[in-house]
């Protein structure tokens, strides 16, 4: 039933491109060769795609035509390997072309850089962009997916077409309306936000299967599937999970046309199969290809089947549980992932994974006991409190969140993990705290049933990318140690951290305190973001600052920003009474 | 009332497929384990398997392969897939409900009236 | 796995004590999950005893079960009419795969 298998064909290259057609063949090259290759200037990767899509023509022409029988990695690595600077821009980065496929695929793939040194985008003016976008359509659309895919080289690339389509009919909409600010603002912003959170959602996946094997992403496919289609037959949902395995296999190994084309026949599959998986595609289905697979992705859950029987029978009360289990040990568990996740969308997703885990220990040491069914009969017991760890965190923090609001709430966090891993570099700990921090706004509005889901699986995402941007520079052992032991446990390591006793305070550096008249024309966001700085900073500098003291400290700060701000001669005052602060701050922190 | 209703027996040429169907009523077939079991003219009692509330499947030796048990419970019925028919599978085939839900314990404490099957040529 | 009943037929009168034995050829699961059935003609069996002991549900007190591992009995203490039938044992064990049933005891009037 697996919805991939085709014949071989002579030319793989041909029969991307008339499955995928010309544009989107074009835009997913350019994807592909942006996330290799992230410092090549744009004028240098259109060169290359136009001379891989003038290839790939010649071979729709005829497959049996030279070198048209290669395998895409071959042509693509190949192409990349053309690129004159490699070895200036990338340096050890140019070894790569030394190898054979399929090695040097994988050593582009183990270049790939989750915080590349490239300038922030900013964004023009209005004006300025509707004239590009009118001036050139194409190159302005293309400028968008380079962007995008060399800042973000994960992003999963058939979404990126859909994020492109969308930022397409935002300019088209709003560069004829009478406000265009007013139009395209708000829609580039929500794009902006849509488009970190997805590409931190499938830098997620690709970790999962690259540093915790298929295994793993399976098992949170079945979690995931299962609670989105509890419908669905067992056999359903492993078919689907295995399609999506091989999806999401591919675009995390840099098969972007094969991803694309076969998350194209999933979509359409899981469409004309919609009676057996859930009542809730139909307006999914109705939609074109991309928002279609779109749609999918994010579609509710479904109502759970009425009448679902007792877990217990099959899993704890039945005498055949070892049997089962022997006979087909990961079918035997996914059944039961299966049958744990329809009967809870109320759980997180990381929460049944743990389940399943501690299910699959008792079984291991239990089948063989010389009491196999007195031994496992309790396992049931054994969930109570993986269940109420997240429960009662979630309750706490949310509460937390209630009682500061998002800013001071992302304070209090920034706070806390700076203590637990002061080592991590600055930006990286403001980064993963505002965004661990935006979990409240997300999820605490959601009724109880809801806020598990919500809440502990944003923060697996979120600690994802503490973890990926931790491993380019490993800094603390703790991180470590939390990222790589177990993926469903992360979060579970990271709240049970305690302070970093071993931490050698930061030597205080007054030029880390220094500020200017520029920051009263950042927007509020940025300012926050400067003041945030400063508190890890601080927390850096003295690590066992009591909550009083370190409120105090940003108290005073902020009203010298404010003040400062209001005054005539903004500089003169940021020197001046910045010192005072400084001086003042030394004094409250004892430092 | 509580009842199961076997239906779908009937006469059959040898090698040829039938499927029956246990239709309960009065009750929710989901909260226990559902069993076959067969009686040929003037003999006894033969076991033919059961099927768990969440769907596991168990055969006596003799029936793998060729008999397939299975449930839909939003239709609140049993089936009993039976294919490669031979003229000593000619019975009665009863359906029971099983005290227990998630495997057999040979306790069946509901059955249905039984339906004939006769494989002949 | 093979489930013995004796004696294979049985005459008595109303009134008489009788007792059937069922013997597997290996331990039932947790040495009592042992079943008695009463079968009349044209009628489906009849769940009379299950684990061993257990009395069903609306089964009259003069049906007992005892035994245990492989060695079971069903005792009718006082014959009545009505409990003219043919009586099976069924014995699971450690797979549902193996659940099986004996070969049956008639019991007619003497």
């Known amino acids: 039933r697996g919805v991939f298998r085709r014949d071989a064909h002579k030319s793989e290259v041909a029969h991307r491109f008339k499955d995928l057609g010309e544009e989107n063949f074009k835009a997913l090259v350019l994807i592909a060769f942006a996330q290799y290759l992230q410092q090549c200037p744009f004028e240098d990767h259109v060169k290359l795609v136009n001379e891989v899509t003038e290839f790939a023509k010649t071979c729709v022409a005829d497959e049996s035509a030279e070198n048209c029988d290669k395998s895409l990695h071959t042509l693509f690595g190949d192409k990349l390997c053309t690129v004159a600077t490699l070895r200036e821009t990338y340096g050890e980065m140019a070894d790569c072309c030394a190898k054979q496929e399929p090695e040097r695929n994988e050593c582009f793939l183990q270049h790939k850089d989750d915080n590349p040194n490239l300038p922030r985008l900013v964004r023009p003016e209005v004006d300025v962009m509707c004239t590009a976008f009118h001036d050139n359509e194409e190159t302005f659309l293309k400028k968008y997916l380079y962007e995008i895919a060399r800042r973000h080289p994960y992003f999963y690339a058939p979404e990126l077409l859909f994020f492109a389509k969308r930022y397409k009919a935002a300019f088209t909409e709003c560069c004829q309306a009478a406000d265009k600010a007013a139009c395209l603002l708000p829609k580039l912003d929500e794009l902006r936000d849509e488009g970190k959170a997805s590409s931190a959602k499938q830098r997620l996946k690709c970790a999962s299967l690259q540093k915790f094997g298929e295994r793993a992403f399976k098992a949170w496919a079945v979690a995931r599937l299962s609670q989105r289609f509890p419908k669905a037959e067992f056999a359903e949902v492993s078919k689907l999970v295995t399609d999506l395995t091989k999806v999401h296999t591919e675009c995390c190994h840099g098969d972007l046309l094969e991803c694309a084309d076969d998350r194209a026949d999933l979509a359409k599959y899981i469409c004309e199969n919609q009676d057996s998986i859930s009542s809730k595609l139909k307006e999914c289905c109705e939609k074109p290809l991309l928002e279609k697979s779109h749609c999918i992705a994010e579609v509710e859950n479904d109502e759970m089947p009425a009448d679902l029987p007792s877990l217990a029978a099959d899993f704890v009360e039945s005498k055949d549980v070892c049997k089962n289990y022997a006979e087909a040990k990961d079918v035997f568990l996914g059944m039961f992932l299966y049958e744990y996740a329809r009967r809870h969308p109320d759980y997180s997703v990381v929460l049944l994974l743990r389940l399943a885990k501690t299910y699959e220990t008792t079984l291991e040491k239990c089948c063989a006991a010389a009491d196999p069914h007195e031994c496992y009969a309790k396992v049931f017991d054994e969930f109570k409190p993986l269940v109420e760890e997240p429960q009662n965190l979630i309750k706490q923090n949310c509460e937390l969140f209630e009682q500061l609001g998002e800013y001071k709430f992302q304070n209090a966090l920034l706070v806390r993990y700076t203590k637990k891993v002061p080592q991590v570099s600055t930006p990286t700990l403001v980064e993963v705290s505002r965004n661990l921090g935006k979990v409240g706004s997300k999820c605490c509005k959601h009724p109880e049933a809801k806020r598990m889901p919500c809440a502990e699986d944003y923060l697996s995402v979120v600690l994802n990318q503490l973890c990926v941007l931790h491993e380019k520079t490993p800094v603390s052992d703790r991180v470590t140690k939390c990222c790589t032991e177990s993926l469903v446990n992360r979060r579970p390591c990271f709240s049970a951290l305690e302070v970093d006793e071993t931490y050698v305070p930061k030597e205080f550096n007054a030029e880390t305190f220094t500020f200017h008249a520029d920051i009263c024309t950042l927007s509020e966001k940025e300012r926050q973001i400067k003041k945030q700085t400063a508190l890890v900073e601080l927390v850096k500098h003295k690590p066992k600052a009591t909550k009083e003291q370190l409120k105090a400290v940003m108290d005073d700060f902020a009203a010298f920003v404010e003040k400062c701000c209001k005054a005539d001669d903004k500089e003169t005052c940021f020197a001046e009474e910045g010192k005072k602060l400084v001086a003042a701050s030394q004094a409250a922190l004892g430092l | 009332e509580v009842q199961l209703v076997e239906s779908g027996g009937g006469l059959v040429q040898p090698g040829g497929s039938l499927r029956l169907s246990c239709a309960a009523s009065?009750?929710?077939?989901?909260?226990?384990?559902m069993g076959w079991v067969r009686q040929a003219p003037g003999k006894g009692l033969e076991y033919i398997g059961i099927?768990?509330?969440?769907?596991?499947?168990y055969y006596a030796s003799w029936a793998k392969g060729r008999f397939t048990i299975s449930r839909d419970n939003s239709k609140n019925t049993v089936y009993l897939q039976m294919n490669s028919l031979r003229a000593e599978d000619t019975a009665t085939y009863f359906c029971?409900?099983?005290?227990?839900?998630?495997?057999?314990?040979?306790?069946?404490?509901?059955w249905g009236q039984g339906t004939l099957v006769t494989v002949s040529s | 796995i093979q489930m013995t009943q004796s004696p294979s037929s049985l005459s008595a009168s109303v009134g008489d004590r009788v007792t059937i034995t069922c013997q597997s050829s290996?331990?039932?699961?947790?040495?009592?999950?042992l079943s008695w059935y009463q079968q009349k003609p044209g009628q489906p069996p009849k769940l009379l005893i299950y684990d061993a002991s257990d009395l069903a549900s609306g089964v009259p007190s003069r049906f007992s079960g005892s035994g245990s591992g492989t060695d079971f009995t069903l005792t009718i203490s006082s014959l009545q009419p009505e409990d003219f039938a043919t009586y099976y044992c069924?014995?699971?064990?450690?797979?549902?795969?193996?659940?099986?049933f004996g070969g049956g005891t008639k019991l007619t009037v003497l």
């Open positions: 099927i768990s509330v969440g769907g596991f499947t």
């Open positions: 069924a014995g699971g064990f450690s797979s549902s795969s193996d659940t099986a």
């Open positions: 009065g009750f929710s077939l989901s909260s226990n384990a």
């Open positions: 290996e331990s039932v699961y947790s040495n009592n999950q």
């Open positions: 029971a409900r099983d005290r227990h839900g998630g495997d057999s314990s040979g306790a069946f404490y509901l």
